[in-house]
Amino acid sequence: MEKALKIDTPQQGSIQDINHRVWVLQDQTLIAVPRKDRMSPVTIALISCRHVETLEKDRGNPIYLGLNGLNLCLMCAKVGDQPTLQLKEKDIMDLYNQPEPVKSFLFYHSQSGRNSTFESVAFPGWFIAVSSEGGCPLILTQELGKANTTDFGLTMLF
């Protein structure tokens, strides 16, 4: 059933991984770097999909993820045969207000304690991840192991 209450603005939050790296925008790419002084981590905009009835149940809360104030949203698309994470110029509220879920831009948000994971709705089994080395772009991965970090700490700002 469609959510009756329509939301006017997305929530805002900050994200870091278990190694205390934050997301930073660099040349239209999101990278994870250790937090330092005079650094500007991105503020995440997130909003739940209104059409949960048309999506798989029990995988998490389907959300759109964007960069607050920048009109950029995270999306998943295949490059060749490989699902990739991309930043696209898109208003997150335009996605929210559509009569259908926009799967390419949707992620199942699951929480376990303080840890959050973000699984692609368009490519089930693929998660937002960062390389354990750091200083690398965010990616999509199927490999939930030591090479990549898929657990993030999401702190809601308001």
Partner: antibody, heavy 123, light 111 residues
């Protein structure tokens, strides 16, 4: 068996407002899973979705028509209605109402349809 | 011009097999949106024929089948019959247009 029936004037003058009503029988308009929609078909041409409404009153419109379209619902009468303002000859079409169904993982689809009503815009 | 592209017409003799294509783009069929098909007999309202690419509603003969690959979909009709003569429309959703979209329709003539 769910049935839909469109009603309203078949002739509307240019610049005026087209008004149509769809009466639903054989089922409730207040179901939690379905939307209700309007689609039109100009003579000899293809189909165009106009907009949809949920029984709570939540609406979605085709962006190119949004400034002229209003869809409303009356659950007590099991009806929903279409108003299209500032019409021109280009709005001449057969107007259909339909239930807008969903399935998990698929976009919504239209089933069943009303028989349709021809609306001509002419002075 | 329609967002989904269909051939204007196809034809076949009784008993033959015909296919109708529906070509979209990365913002509709290619964006994980399935395709539905409708049959419109002359002078009547459209009727749902296939939903979710390849599912038949009850009452639709198994002579009708659908498939989808990449940014395209197709409807196949086997054992063509005279009563299959109609217009056929594909439908999907386009997130760039924020709306449900139809193909331009294909007129099937049974020879």
């Amino acid at each position: 068996e769910l049935q839909l029936q469109e009603s309203g004037p078949g002739l509307v003058k240019p610049s005026e407002t087209l008004s149509l009503t769809c009466t639903v029988s054989g089922g409730s308009i207040s179901t939690s899973s379905d939307y209700w929609g309007w689609i039109r078909q100009p003579p000899g041409k293809g189909l165009e979705w106009i907009g949809s409404i949920y029984y709570t009153g939540n609406t979605y419109y085709l962006p190119s028509l949004k400034s002229r379209v209003t869809i409303s619902v009356d659950t007590s009468k099991n009806q929903f209605s279409l108003k299209l303002s500032s019409v021109t000859a280009a709005d001449t079409a057969v107007y259909y109402c339909s239930r807008v169904r969903y399935g998990v993982g698929v976009p919504r689809y239209f089933d069943p349809w009303g028989q349709g009503t021809l609306v001509t815009v002419s002075s | 011009e329609s967002v989904l592209t269909q051939p204007p017409s196809v034809s076949g003799a009784p008993g033959q097999r015909v296919t109708i294509s529906c070509t979209g783009s990365s913002s509709n069929i290619g964006a994980h949106y399935d395709v539905h098909w409708y049959q419109q007999l002359p002078g009547t309202a459209p009727k749902l024929l296939i939903y979710g690419n390849d599912n038949r509603p009850s009452g639709v003969p198994d002579r009708f089948s659908g498939s989808k690959s990449g940014t395209s979909a197709s409807l196949a009709i086997t054992g063509l019959q005279a009563e299959d003569e109609a217009d056929y429309y594909c439908q999907s959703y386009d997130y760039s247009l924020s709306g449900y979209v139809f193909g331009g329709g294909t007129k099937l003539t049974v020879l």
